[in-house]
Amino acid sequence: KESCDVQLYIKRQSEHSILAGDPFELECPVKYCANRPHVTWCKLNGTTCVKLEDRQTSWKEEKNISFFILHFEPVLPNDNGSYRCSANFQSNLIESHSTTLYVTDVKSASERPSKDEMASRPWLLYR
């Protein structure tokens, strides 16, 4: 019997390499049964995840799954980082794995820095 709990299908350690200046949609796949849960996006800042209040979001409904989308209009260099979606369902908070955006300038898009480099030299992301 299929579970009727809300599930968020962001894969562990998922990542996207994207270019500054382009539009981009970050999807949070949401599985639910009856009532669509309230879903939000947040951006990780150290150990806390800061809720993205003023950002454009939308729902895309498909047959077996829905997507809660965070719109980047357009991507900016400071959008680099890790994001998480979370759903409120029957007083429970369900959190997704984090997904990381690697934002690069088109000039350095072919030379994506390693995670270690990024941690120590974040300016590599927008040269």
Partner: antibody, heavy 119, light 107 residues
Amino acid sequence: QITLKESGPTLVKPTQTLTLTCTFSGFSLSTSGVGVGWIRQPPGKALEWLAQEFWTGDKRYSPSLKSRLTITKDTSKNQVVLTMTNMDPVDTATYYCTHKLGMNYFDYWGQGTLVTVSS
Amino acid sequence: DIQMTQSPSSVSASVGDRVTITCRASQGISSWLAWYQQKPGKAPKLLIYAASGLQSGVPSRFSGSGSGTDFTLTISSLQPEDFATYYCQQANSFPFTFGPGTKVDIK
């Protein structure tokens, strides 16, 4: 060397549809980070961003004109076409085709084409 | 939409003068601002990107500064070819918007 050139009618009648073509060389619209767009400038007035086609196939429009604008690309011909419906005398302007690479700063511009809307 | 305002709307100056033009955004745009120069009958030319980056081929007498909502374009020593209209443009969010322009003319 990057060049862009606008072509289309210089005079259109009110209610007609304007079709402008931007023919470019020196770059490809399938190259990462590239965008080709349209900006207009009424005589003696400021610049107004209209629409942009991105290398990804995404398109974005000015919200105030979105219902009247369509931007399309023909990558093989190195062309981007802007259509604007229901033209009005207030749409009289010089229309520029622009190039961007990466962030949305317009580093190359066509010479511009003056479109007059009059009956 | 983000509204861009510029001041002054026009400035009269002499060759050799230092000229400063300001641009203000109706909301914070970080450093995602460009400056353009336009001469009569010509297309605009990109001078400054990302608030302070000098576009290739642009003379070093042009400089830009600022972040958030307030930005400045400075011409350190005005040359005869600098008499033109200058526009700022925000690249922070769609739709991209321009300031109304500042005309620099001969005193």
